[in-house]
Interface confidence: low
């Protein structure tokens, strides 16, 4: 970046999307900026329009193809540039050589559902979305359960160190409303980060049978 402090961060969802955020102190809010993607060994290139997400940061998604198409591999390098319009010209504000499989952030898990619920336990399953077949089974998950009277931030994290798309929650309180979220991360990639949390799944444990200890 030419003026101010610039930060340009991008993640690959492992299939056909690169999401980028560009932050620039002192940048003009009404400037038109784009992200340009130029792979080193492929015939396509792609552009997206940066849209403001806060006072000094912009974001956009490079859509490389249909959601489940494998557009990049572990060996691709994509040159990413932030280009901003200055009058009739475009000025390069930031650049990075982007290694997609070193900068992974998968889509949030989907299709959360209660498989079986009892008084003290609940079995929940989910599916991963738009995840590359290159990972094989090398994924890990984090899950959290929201209990009454607590916040998500207070919820303890449960770690699943393998590709396991289900969990059995134990020691729950009978006849109680809970919410559950899960996120996923590939084991591959130096700068890989967790996916966003899934949409919360609400469920209620069964009431304890009358006359039984709870």
């Amino acid at each position: 970046a030419v003026n101010g402090t610039s930060r340009f961060t991008c993640f690959y969802n492992s299939r056909a999307n690169i999401s980028c955020v560009w932050s620039q102190d002192g940048a003009l809010q009404d400037t038109s900026c784009q992200v340009h993607a130029w792979p080193d060994r492929r015939r396509w290139n792609q552009t997206c329009e940066l849209l403001p997400v806060s006072q000094a940061s912009w974001a956009c998604n490079l859509i490389l193809g249909t959601p489940d198409s494998q557009k990049l591999t572990a060996v691709d390098i994509v040159t990413l540039r932030v280009m901003c319009r200055e009058g009739v010209r475009w000025r390069m504000m930031a650049i990075q050589d982007f290694k997609p499989f070193e900068n992974l952030r998968l889509m949030a898990p989907i299709s959360l559902q209660v498989v079986h619920v009892e008084t003290h336990r609940c079995n929940i399953s989910w599916k991963i979305s738009q995840a590359s077949h290159y990972f094989e089974r090398h994924l890990e998950f984090e899950a959290r359960t929201l209990s009454p009277g607590h916040t998500w931030e207070e919820a303890p994290l449960m770690t699943l160190k393998q590709k396991q798309e289900w969990i059995c929650l134990e020691t729950l309180t009978p006849d109680t409303q809970y919410e559950f979220q899960v996120r996923v991360k590939p084991l591959q990639g130096e700068f890989t980060t967790w996916s966003p949390w899934s949409q919360p799944l609400a469920f209620r444990t069964k009431p304890a049978a009358l006359g039984k200890d709870t």
Partner: antibody, heavy 119, light 106 residues
């Protein structure tokens, strides 16, 4: 113990097809990719293609028009079919599996099956 | 395709000798492997990811290098090391092997 066992080799007429099987044990083909590599007599190794755990395939572009790799998860077996065979396809055909990660190299190999293309 | 060129094509050395094989890639590669193949046998993985020793492989075998230039070394040649050695890249498809280096005992 991880084992790969190829079968289906033998004599094939020029212009014919071959279908090889690779029976896996000690792991499941729904969890690991299986690759095919061949070696012509007195020659080096040549990578032909791979079937990933989810069933997707990547092929060597030199063979893509006449090569199909498939699998039967219930039998834990991977299949290799090549059409329009010619004399230069005479080789020992191996199936191989990487280590725990795709980039751990071919840690496990079958014993190989010889395919001879001749009239 | 990435071409992998090994040198020498063959070599003859005495037991206890240090043996070095080089592998040159036509373009930069990230993941390089070395295999040993004894006559009539399937290849055996010796080195993965350039310099890591595969399970059960003696420590006399080693690998190094980066970019386009890689080296495989047997620090002290043993009679059981008579074989052909191959390098292989796993940086882009198709995966490609070197043409092999045949190692014999003098």
């Amino acid at each position: 113990e991880v084992q790969l066992l190829e079968s289906g080799g033998g004599l094939v007429q020029p212009g014919g097809s071959l279908r090889l099987s690779c029976a896996a044990s000690g792991f499941t083909v729904t969890s690991y990719a299986v690759h095919w590599v061949r070696q012509a007599p007195g020659k080096g190794l040549e990578w032909l293609g791979v079937i990933w755990s989810g069933g997707s395939t990547d092929y060597n572009a030199a063979f893509i028009s006449r090569l199909t790799i498939s699998k039967d998860n219930s039998k834990n077996t991977v299949y290799f079919q090549m059409n329009s065979l010619r004399a230069e396809d005479t080789a020992v055909y191996y199936c191989a599996r990487a280590g725990d990660y795709n980039y751990d190299g071919f840690a496990y190999w079958g014993q190989g099956t010889l395919v001879t293309v001749s009239s | 395709d990435i071409q992998m060129t090994q040198s020498p094509s063959s070599l003859s050395a005495s037991v206890g000798d240090r043996v070095t094989i080089t592998c040159q890639a036509s373009q930069s590669v990230s993941f390089l492997y070395w295999y040993q193949q004894r006559p009539g046998k399937a290849p055996r993985l010796l080195i993965y990811d350039t310099s890591n020793l595969a399970s059960g492989v003696p420590s006399r075998f080693s690998g190094s290098g980066s970019g386009t230039s890689y080296t495989f070394t047997i620090s002290s040649l043993q009679p059981e090391d008579i074989a052909t050695y191959y390098c292989q890249q796993w940086s882009t498809y198709p995966l490609t092997f070197g043409q092999g280096t045949k190692v014999e005992i003098k």
